[in-house]
Amino acid sequence: EEELQVIQPDKSVLVAAGETATLRCTATSLIPVGPIQWFRGAGPGRELIYNQKEGHFPRVTTVSDLTKRNNMDFSIRIGNITPADAGTYYCVKFRKGSPDDVEFKSGAGTELSVRAKPSAPVVSGPAARATPQHTVSFTCESHGFSPRDITLKWFKNGNELSDFQTNVDPVGESVSYSIHSTAKVVLTREDVHSQVICEVAHVTLQGDPLRGTANLSETIRVPPTLEVTQQPVRAENQVNVTCQVRKFYPQRLQLTWLENGNVSRTETASTVTENKDGTYNWMSWLLVNVSAHRDDVKLTCQVEHDGQPAVSKSHDLKVSAHPKEQGSNTAAENTGSNERNIY
């Protein structure tokens, strides 16, 4: 029969970060006389966790089960557990010696594993906007979780994406881990209202995954389509020419009217109308006075959208006694109209 047994009944203990870990240890005897100390790790580099007699261990409290007649309780509690506390803890009996105590017997060790929640996933998109039909990359990052097993999924408007690559670091053992994933998304013209979602599932989240989102409105640029039309005569020698700028996003847009290549007027889109898909429409017009001698005016609507190279649409001004009606005349009602006289 052994002189003394040091019993650590728990091979492993799993604790959530922020909680308290109880590390159990009993000894069958006080003899041989000498202290019991707790260490993390084994060998010369082991870390002293608790020594009853000396030292300051603010996170450690003792736990005594006084009801057990046949052994001594040397269990401890460690408060406010973090992933850095993970490791194997040993309850070690020393025998009093001179000048130093001698290690007599160690418990089998208790492996403390810390369950730490992943941080909220952060999704980031490309630095520059891209147009429909282009493929853009989104990244998702989450940190500080343990254990290593984790599941990450990507969604676009609720539909799961398949084109992504995920890494969990580090590859080897660590107190906590990070996940990094990159997803490829093909943009469509309807994506202004779309969302890309990164969803992270981990044992600590109890079936309630964390989500990070990115709005494609921050990523997409939908270039406008232009249409220039000549409206009916409003008054003697007056022609209304409109430039309809349709289906663009974002709103930042500047329009310039050119007459025979010369700048006539520049304006910035202000009172726009929003389409159901999140894109915008805008209309600008020019009131032109024409004389019988001037029917060869080339009017150009030039649009610079979101800092991109300008696109333009031209219209040869048709002047006759009774010009044919083209398009809508609603623009003529707009008080924001501008008049340009041509002699």
């Epitope: 002189e3 003394l4 069958t28 006080l30 019991i36 003792t62 007649r69 046949n70």
Partner: antibody, heavy 118, light 112 residues
Amino acid sequence: EVQLVESGGGLVKPGGSLRLSCAASGFTFSSYVMSWVRQTPGKGLEWVATISSGGTYTYYPDSVKGRFTLSRDNAKNSLYLQMNSLRAEDTAVYYCASQLTGSEFDYWGQGTTVTVSS
Amino acid sequence: DIVLTQSPASLAVSLGERATISCRASESVDLYGTSFMHWYQQKPGQPPKLLIYRASNLESGVPDRFSGSGSRTDFTLTINPLQAEDVATYYCHQSSDELPWTFGGGTKVEIK
């Protein structure tokens, strides 16, 4: 029923020797730390010696260290205290006591009286 | 050495009343939250008998009118209510991991 029966006490001259024995029964002797505690009318109870369950480790207070030797024979369920160089102040009733955990004294024998006198 | 001071040295209490005995240690006898202080009863002509182990645990077969409390350096044995058969001398004893183990001087309890 646990029983501890001491023997070997008696009258001895100062400087003399005595060997006390304790016969144990009714429990697993080899699992217990065993001790001797003495009681004098003047000094009350005094711990004298302790031996580990396997017999490897022995402990004594300074008052008897070097003069008393504690041993055990687990095969015979017996505990022995060899007392040499006895002094008048060693006069006392000597109790054999068991300690399951090397802590509190669970069971005590009836005691044997040692008188050191010229 | 850890010195145990028991008080009072003697105590006379009426039957059915509470008897309280104090034991003060010169330094803490606690290890890992356990107080290694024990109480024994000794009647004339008999060996001591364990009543309370590790400050507050009642030894098997001991009546529950005996109770122990305290930690670190201050401990109390209470007998409530006192019965005629409780007339005896009571000793405290510390068995911390600092040798030598020591006993208190004893408290003699009598019936008033």
